[in-house]
C-alpha cells in the first residue's frame, strides 16, 4: 500500500512539476525591468525565452518574437535547449510512469516490468528536473552578470554618447516558477525511484501450500489481492500558452486590477 502511495504521489508531484516547467518555458517574464533606484518610467520592459515585451502604463502591450536563431546569445540558446530537453524527458517519463502505476492493470504485466518502468520514469524525472533547474540557473547567472555590468555603465562617465536609458533587468516570475517546478519534478523522480524498490518482487524460498479441509478444499496462495482501485488524476487540460501564428503581437491589454499606472 505504501509503495502504491509513494508511486502515485511521485507521479502527481512530477506531473505538477512538468506542467510548471512547460509554463515557465512559455512565460514572457524571465527577466523584468529593474524598478529599484531607477527613474520612474511609464513603460515597463520584460523578456522571455521566445519574445520580449513592452507594457505601457496606458495598458497597451507589445510583444516581439526573436525572429533570428544565429543572432541570439549562445547562453539563451543553451537555456532554451535545457528547458526543451527537460520537457521532452518529463513528457516521456510521464507516459512511461502511467503504465508503471501499480494501481493500473495492463494485461498480465509482471511486477518486475512495472518496477523497471517506474525506475526508468524516475530517472527521467530526475534528469528533467535537473535540466530545468540548470536552465533557470544559467539564465539567472546571465542576468546577474548583465545587471552588474549595466550598473557599472550607469556610473561611469559615458558622456553624451549614450542615446538610450540604461535598462537593467532583474529576475522575473518565470525563474521562480522554473526553480520550483524543477525541484518538484526532481522530488517526484526520487519518489518513483524509491517506489521502484518496493515494487521489485523479492525471491521466495517456499512454494504455495495447499491445506485440505474436510468437505471442501480451498487453496491459499501467498501474495495478497491486487488492488483495482481506479487511481486516476482528473486534471483538466489548461491552455498554458497560445503560440499564435503572428509575427508581431500587438495587444491592447487593458489595465487590470494589478497594473501600475
Amino acid at each position: 500500500m505504501a509503495v502504491t502511495a509513494c508511486q502515485g504521489l511521485g507521479f502527481v508531484v512530477s506531473l505538477i512539476g512538468i506542467a510548471g516547467i512547460i509554463a515557465a518555458t512559455c512565460m514572457d517574464q524571465w527577466s523584468t525591468q529593474d524598478l529599484y533606484n531607477n527613474p520612474v518610467t511609464a513603460v515597463f520592459n520584460y523578456q522571455g525565452l521566445w519574445r520580449s515585451c513592452v507594457r505601457e502604463s496606458s495598458g497597451f502591450t507589445e510583444c516581439r518574437g526573436y525572429f533570428t536563431l544565429l543572432g541570439l546569445p549562445a547562453m539563451l540558446q543553451a537555456v532554451r535547449a535545457l528547458m526543451i530537453v527537460g520537457i521532452v524527458l518529463g513528457a516521456i517519463g510521464l507516459l512511461v510512469s502511467i503504465f508503471a502505476l501499480k494501481c493500473i492493470r495492463i494485461g498480465s504485466m509482471e511486477d518486475s516490468a512495472k518496477a523497471n518502468m517506474t525506475l526508468t520514469s524516475g530517472i527521467m524525472f530526475i534528469v528533467s528536473g535537473l535540466c530545468a533547474i540548470a536552465g533557470v540557473s544559467v539564465f539567472a547567472n546571465m542576468l546577474v552578470t548583465n545587471f552588474w555590468m549595466s550598473t557599472a555603465n550607469m556610473y561611469t562617465g559615458m558622456g553624451g554618447m549614450v542615446q538610450t536609458v540604461q535598462t537593467r533587468y532583474t529576475f522575473g516570475a518565470a525563474l521562480f516558477v522554473g526553480w520550483v517546478a524543477g525541484g518538484l519534478t526532481l522530488i517526484g523522480g526520487v519518489m518513483m525511484c524509491i517506489a521502484c524498490r518496493g515494487l521489485a518482487p523479492e525471491e521466495t524460498n517456499y512454494k504455495a501450500v495447499s491445506y485440505h479441509a474436510s468437505g471442501h478444499s480451498v487453496a491459499y496462495k501467498p501474495g495478497g489481492f491486487k488492488a483495482s482501485t481506479g487511481f486516476g488524476s482528473n486534471t483538466k487540460n489548461k491552455k498554458i500558452y497560445d503560440g499564435g501564428a503572428r509575427t508581431e503581437d500587438e495587444v491592447q491589454s487593458y489595465p487590470s486590477k494589478h497594473d501600475y499606472v
Partner: antibody, heavy 118, light 113 residues
Framework: QVQLVQSGAEVKKPGSSVKVSCKPS????????IDWVRQAPGQGLEWMGG????????VYNEKFQGRVTITADESTSTAYMELSSLRSEDTAVYFC???????????WGQGTLVTVSS | DIVMTQSPDSLAVSLGERATINCKSS????????????LTWYQQKPGQPPKLLIY???TRESGVPDRFSGSGSGKDFTLTISSLQAEDVAVYYC?????????FGGGTKVEIK
C-alpha cells in the same frame, strides 16, 4: 464616438478646494487611464496626475503631491480631480484626457476654468 | 523632472511653405525594449483642448493629415508641416511620455507670414 464631458466653471476662494468631474462616454470606462492636465491663462500645459479606473491606482506629479486627489467612480463612470489649499496661481483651465498607446492623450475634455480669487 | 525645450517660441511661415518645430529632451526618450521614442506632438487652437497629432515620435494619429510628420530619436525631435495651411495656425506642444512626471514643452506658436 469617444467624448469626455467635464463639469462647469468654478470660482473659489484661496485656501479652499475644488472638485472637477469628468464623464467619459463611447468606450468602456475601466479600459483606459484618465489623466488630468492644467493650463494657466496664456501658459503651457502641465500634467497633474492620472488614475487607472479599474483598480483605483493613481500616479501624481510631485509638484501637486498632497494637494491633488484623483478618484474614479465605476458605478457612474466618472473621474474626479480635487485640488485643495487653492492659491491664485492655481487659476487655470483643467482638462481630463484619456491615455492610449504611446502613453499619449487622444481624447480630451472641453476643459473646466477654475478661478481662484479673494 | 525631464525638461522639454521647444524652439522656436513662435514661427511665421507663408502658406504652402514648410514649417519645422524642434523639441529637445533633457534625457533620452528611447526605450530599449521596443526601440520606440516616447514623445508625442499636440496641436492646440485657441479656446480648444489639445489635439493628438503624433505619438511614438513618428506615428501619425488616424485622421491627421499626412502633411504632419514627426522625426528624431533619443533627445532631439522634429515636427514638420510640409505645406502650411490656414487651419494649421495653432500652438504646438511636444510631450515626454516616458518618464514621470509626464512633461510638456513650452509650446511653439505657428502663424502665417
Amino acid at each position: 464616438q469617444v467624448q469626455l464631458v467635464q463639469s462647469g466653471a468654478e470660482v473659489k476662494k484661496p485656501g479652499s478646494s475644488v472638485k472637477v468631474s469628468c464623464k467619459p462616454s463611447g468606450y468602456t470606462f475601466t479600459n483606459y487611464l484618465i489623466d488630468w492636465v492644467r493650463q494657466a491663462p496664456g501658459q503651457g500645459l502641465e500634467w497633474m496626475g492620472g488614475i487607472n479606473p479599474g483598480s483605483g491606482d493613481t500616479v501624481y506629479n510631485e509638484k501637486f503631491q498632497g494637494r491633488v486627489t484623483i478618484t474614479a467612480d465605476e458605478s457612474t463612470s466618472t473621474a474626479y480631480m480635487e485640488l485643495s489649499s487653492l492659491r491664485s496661481e492655481d487659476t487655470a483651465v483643467y482638462f481630463c484626457a484619456r491615455r492610449v498607446r504611446g502613453n499619449s492623450f487622444d481624447s480630451w475634455g472641453q476643459g473646466t476654468l477654475v478661478t481662484v480669487s479673494s | 523632472d525631464i525638461v522639454m525645450t521647444q524652439s522656436p517660441d513662435s514661427l511665421a511661415v507663408s502658406l504652402g511653405e514648410r514649417a519645422t518645430i524642434n523639441c529637445k529632451s533633457s534625457q533620452s526618450l528611447l526605450n530599449s525594449g521596443n526601440q520606440k521614442n516616447y514623445l508625442t506632438w499636440y496641436q492646440q487652437k485657441p479656446g480648444q483642448p489639445p489635439k493628438l497629432l503624433i505619438y511614438w515620435a513618428s506615428t501619425r494619429e488616424s485622421g491627421v493629415p499626412d502633411r504632419f510628420s514627426g522625426s528624431g530619436s533619443g533627445k532631439d525631435f522634429t515636427l514638420t508641416i510640409s505645406s502650411l495651411q490656414a487651419e494649421d495656425v495653432a500652438v504646438y506642444y511636444c510631450q515626454n511620455n516616458y518618464f514621470y512626471p509626464l512633461t510638456f514643452g513650452g509650446g511653439t506658436k505657428v502663424e502665417i507670414k
